[in-house]
Interface confidence: low
């Protein structure tokens, strides 16, 4: 079986303040089993934006139905973008583990830049 790849096709996305930003992410395989998460930034200080497994993320909606058994599209849309949302977003695949899931592979990242709201 081909090893899973995490594909973030856009290196950068530019959105006007107040609009929604779509950040695309796809997996090439259903294996290994485990959730995906979206983070802003990398390293220890990264900010969790979305966790497929748990949590409440009112500004984030998934582009496709993540609960569907064969789903490979983990794109998200973030509503009401503000300049504070600028940064690089990473789509990260975790491998199911006990007691904790283990980070398996990260996408290359998509840099979100925020333009001033059109007057």
């Amino acid at each position: 079986e081909d090893e899973l790849q995490v594909i973030q096709p856009e290196k950068s996305v530019s959105v006007a303040a107040g609009e929604s930003a779509t950040l695309r992410c796809a997996m090439t395989s259903l294996i290994p089993v485990g959730p995906i998460m979206w983070f802003r930034g990398a390293g220890a200080g990264r900010e969790l934006i979305y966790n497929q497994k748990e949590g409440h993320f009112p500004r984030v909606t998934t582009v496709s139905e993540l609960t569907k058994r064969n789903n490979l599209d983990f794109s998200i849309s973030i509503s009401n973008i503000t300049p504070a949302d600028a940064g690089t977003y990473y789509c990260v695949k975790f491998r199911k583990g006990s007691p904790d899931d283990v980070e398996f592979k990260s996408g290359a990242g998509t840099e979100l830049s925020v333009r001033a709201k059109p007057s």
């Epitope: 081909d2 594909i7 259903l30 294996i31 496709s64 490979l72 599209d73």
Partner: antibody, heavy 120, light 107 residues
């Protein structure tokens, strides 16, 4: 190994339809977009469209909009391309081709091609 | 749609020589460009994707370069099995258009 096996050659009359199949093996069928590309005799390659085998979603080149239908049967890992209202200039070899990744960076595995001849 | 123009249409090269093939896009396609090789009666074979990444199993004599609108495929030392038609394809904007091809023939 990873391979795509297409259905055999077809001879059709103008105005008819043709349906070409493409059976995938050796990989997770739902994990890769499938493209269809054609090549008229002595000519170059022409992209027709793609299907996402996972969702069934499609994207067609404007030129074929309304005449082409791409479908799939995940239970048998097979993609289909149907072209209707055939004309003589649809005579070509039709290829299915797998995406390199879930989004398009190239087509790394190709079927052997299916020759479609449209002649009265 | 984005128009891909390949040059030259035909390239006559002796075995062992270097071959340089060009592909130009009518607008920027970033690095979303692939190169394929096709021999008579066969399906195309992916050589290069993302403008410069060699596909699995492709020999190191094949290299791709460029970004934006200008791209080059270089075959450093032509082998007998390299004489074929080469196509570029942009995968940046729908529809994913191909160039018209460059035929590399024996001089």
């Amino acid at each position: 190994q990873v391979q795509l096996v297409q259905s055999g050659a077809e001879v059709k009359k103008p105005g008819a339809s043709v349906k070409v199949s493409c059976k995938a093996s050796g990989y997770t069928f739902t994990g890769y977009y499938m493209h269809w590309v054609r090549q008229a005799p002595g000519q170059g390659l022409e992209w027709m469209g793609w299907i996402n085998p996972n969702s069934g979603g499609t994207s067609y080149a404007q030129k074929f909009q309304g005449r082409v239908t791409m479908t799939r049967d995940t239970s048998i890992s097979t993609a289909y391309m149907e072209l209707s209202r055939l004309r003589s200039d649809d005579t070509a070899v039709y290829y299915c081709a797998r995406d390199t990744y879930a989004y398009s960076y190239g087509m790394d595995v190709w079927g052997q091609g299916t020759t479609v001849t449209v002649s009265s | 749609e984005i128009v891909m123009t390949q040059s030259p249409a035909t390239l006559s090269v002796s075995p062992g020589e270097r071959a340089t093939l060009s592909c130009r896009a009518s607008q920027s396609v970033s690095s979303n460009l692939a190169w394929y090789q096709q021999k008579p009666g066969q399906a195309p074979r992916l050589l290069i994707y993302s403008a410069s990444t060699r596909a699995t199993g492709i020999p190191a004599r094949f290299s791709g370069s460029g970004s934006g609108t200008e791209f080059t495929l270089t075959i450093s030392s032509l082998q007998s099995e390299d004489f074929a038609v080469y196509y570029c394809q942009q995968l940046d904007n729908l529809p994913y258009t191909f160039g018209g091809g460059t035929k590399v023939e024996i001089k």
